[in-house]
């Protein structure tokens, strides 16, 4: 015979074809072998011109031989080489599917591999690819979109060889709050790490605001709106700066009175103040907290104290905000000017958390009167807020 070729090669099959001998023959003897694969020999009829090779090993180079027989006579042997395809991984499955995460698992192919190519695509056409190592049989997908259909595909790799892709389809679960209006809703969506998040005032996606969420203190879900920790940020700022906010949300900052007004207008909020100084800690919680709009000069409402720091905010309840360039306090002198800060001053303060960092002069520093008095500037202070009914919401989520 002549012209031996292979076609339709897969990971376990191939079709051998040849041109028949010119003379009439009784039979053809076909043999094939590969590395670490014992030789298989088959005899077929002399009028056959193709033979299906089955049960081949994947990703293996085979040597195929064929010769003709007529009675006791044997023709010369012709040879062809071919390599089977890399077989695919098996049983690709998406498990632990959440709103933004899922776990892909699969069984490895029979052939050895040098890695896997994972491709996952959402219905909107967003495609992501990742290559993982040869010993990997699972991969955690993150940053997925909630309520979205995904197609995940996997292909085994071995050098230049690529297997066929297999796929699975899954749908991420919907977020409880697609546009969380505060850190409590972000937390109820499953975000439990403190850090920067985007919230949407009144749940409006056009009203995005980046905030720092404290997800650990007393159950978490707090929007931090003030942090003092090292004195690097200047808090002796004007009205405009305090209205808009300033500083680095990861470091020292003030979120802004306009933002506080918009947030507390969304519902009933509680205030938490965390204080730390030379290893000592104290806190104050007020179960009613709100900040009025610019027309009220951001009037403070703070009621319902509990905690260990002492109720120093009660003195400031009902007061408008004051800065050195907009004096709304009841003092003849300007409290913000006198004490180099800004606050809901009265005449003047029991709380001066926006005072001069590290200044232990009377009433000048970061003060919380009922904890450390007016002659000790506190090292660390945070003010934060969350919905007053957060405990109920959290319980409902856990039951769900």
């Amino acid at each position: 015979p002549s012209g031996l070729v292979t076609a339709n090669i897969t990971d376990s099959e191939a079709l051998a074809r040849w041109q028949p001998a010119i003379a009439t023959v009784d039979s053809y003897v076909i043999s094939y072998t590969g590395e670490k694969v014992p030789e298989i020999t088959r005899t077929v009829s002399g009028n056959t011109v193709e033979y299906a090779l089955t049960d081949l090993e994947p990703a293996t180079e085979y040597t195929l031989r064929i010769f003709a027989e007529k009675g006791p006579q044997k023709s010369s042997t012709i040879t062809a080489k071919f390599t089977t395809d890399l077989d695919s991984p098996r049983d690709l499955t998406a498990t632990e599917v959440q709103s933004e995460t899922a776990l892909l698992t699969w069984r490895p192919p029979r052939a050895s591999v040098t890695g896997y190519l994972l491709v996952y695509e959402s219905v909107d056409g967003t495609v992501k690819e990742v290559i993982v190592g040869p010993d990997t049989t699972s991969y955690s997908l993150a940053d997925l979109s909630p309520s979205t259909h995904y197609t995940a595909k996997i292909q085994a790799l071995n050098g230049p060889l690529r297997s066929n892709m297999i796929q699975t389809i899954f749908t991420t679960i919907g977020l409880l709050y697609p546009f969380p209006k505060d850190c409590s809703q972000a937390m109820l969506n499953g975000d439990t790490t403190s850090g920067l998040y985007t919230i949407y005032l009144n749940g409006d996606k056009a009203e995005a605001l980046e905030v720092f969420c404290d997800m650990t203190s007393d159950g978490g879900g707090w929007i931090v709106f003030l942090r003092r920790k090292n004195g690097r940020e200047n808090f002796y700022q004007n009205w405009k700066a305090y209205a808009a906010g300033f500083g680095d949300r990861r470091e020292e900052f003030w979120l802004g009175l306009d933002n506080l007004n918009k947030i507390t207008a969304q519902g009933q909020y509680e205030l938490r103040v965390d204080l730390r100084d030379h290893g000592e800690t104290a806190f104050a919680v007020y179960d009613k907290f709100s900040v009025g709009d610019a027309k009220t000069r951001y009037k403070l409402k703070v009621e319902g104290y509990s905690g260990t720091a002492g109720d120093s905010m009660a003195y400031h309840n009902g007061r408008s905000f004051s800065t050195f360039d907009k004096d709304t306090d009841s003092a003849i002198t300007n409290c913000a000017l006198s004490y180099k800060g800004a606050f809901w001053y009265r005449n003047c303060h029991r709380v001066n958390l926006m005072g001069r960092y590290g200044d232990n002069n009377h009433s000048q520093g970061v003060n919380w009167f009922h904890w450390k008095g007016h002659e000790h500037s506190i090292q660390f202070a945070e003010m934060k807020l969350r919905p007053s009914n957060f405990r109920n919401l959290e319980g409902r989520r856990k039951r769900a």
Partner: antibody, heavy 120, light 107 residues
Framework: EVQLVESGGGLVQPGRSLRLSCAAS????????MHWVRQAPGKGLEWVSG????????YYADSVKYRFTISRDNAKNSLYLQMNSLRAEDTALYYC?????????????WGQGTMVTVSS | DIQMTQSPSSLSASVGDRVTITCRAS??????LNWYQQKPGKAPKLLIY???SLQSGVPSRFSGSGSGTDFTLTISSLQPEDFATYYC?????????FGQGTKVDIK
């Protein structure tokens, strides 16, 4: 109209006890701290004791600490002063006073007072 | 405890006079100072809080000033109903202490 009415005063022997009451009306009682202030005959004003709006925090002058106990019943809009181990120097007109805040601050409304006389 | 010292202890004045009473705190108290008026046989009445804020219903002839340790109550034009005893009080810390009082009587 905001009103405070004290009662419970009288003549008592040294070492004995007396309980003063103050009935409040015309305002949301538990939103405000309350106080007792006394005035000995012909003398000035002396703050005696105070209690926060919730009743969770109490405050005393050194002269009455461990002898007097301030308390409140927000459901009944009432303030109390339990006075034990009374001394002659406790003789005074005792005023109940409302604060402007939930914690000790400024006394904006006063009752007319109840007289306590400690004498044998 | 913070000591409050008023001066003078008493003064005689005529209707229409400008009267000034001073109060000194033994330590810095920001503006945590109140003024009360007491007439014989009556309960005290709040006149000024936060050193300079006029209590609702109090005539504008009464005014307060000062900050830190030194404070002043001024009656711009003394009226017959103003003859009384005036007390300052610090609300900075407990115990909340009063001055010894200033008696204003008719000259």
């Amino acid at each position: 109209e905001v009103q405070l009415v004290e009662s419970g005063g009288g003549l008592v022997q040294p070492g004995r006890s007396l309980r003063l009451s103050c009935a409040a009306s015309g305002f949301t009682f538990d939103d405000y701290a309350m106080h007792w202030v006394r005035q000995a005959p012909g003398k000035g004003l002396e703050w005696v004791s105070g209690i926060s709006g919730s009743g969770g925090s109490t405050y005393y002058a050194d002269s009455v600490k461990y002898r007097f106990t301030i308390s409140r019943d927000n459901a009944k809009n009432s303030l109390y002063l339990q006075m034990n181990s009374l001394r002659a120097e406790d003789t005074a007109l005792y005023y109940c006073a409302k604060d402007i805040s939930a914690v000790p601050d400024t006394f904006d409304i006063w009752g007319q007072g109840t007289m306590v006389t400690v004498s044998s | 405890d913070i000591q409050m010292t008023q001066s003078p202890s008493s003064l005689s004045a005529s209707v229409g006079d400008r009267v000034t009473i001073t109060c000194r705190a033994s330590q810095y108290i920001q503006g945590f100072l109140n003024w009360y008026q007491q007439k014989p046989g009556k309960a005290p009445k709040l006149l000024i809080y936060d050193a300079s804020s006029l209590q609702s219903g109090v005539p504008s002839r009464f005014s307060g000033s000062g900050s830190g340790t030194d404070f002043t109550l001024t009656i711009s034009s003394l009226q017959p109903e103003d003859f009384a005893t005036y007390y300052c009080q610090q609300s900075y810390s407990t115990p909340q202490t009063f001055g010894q009082g200033t008696k204003v009587d008719i000259k």
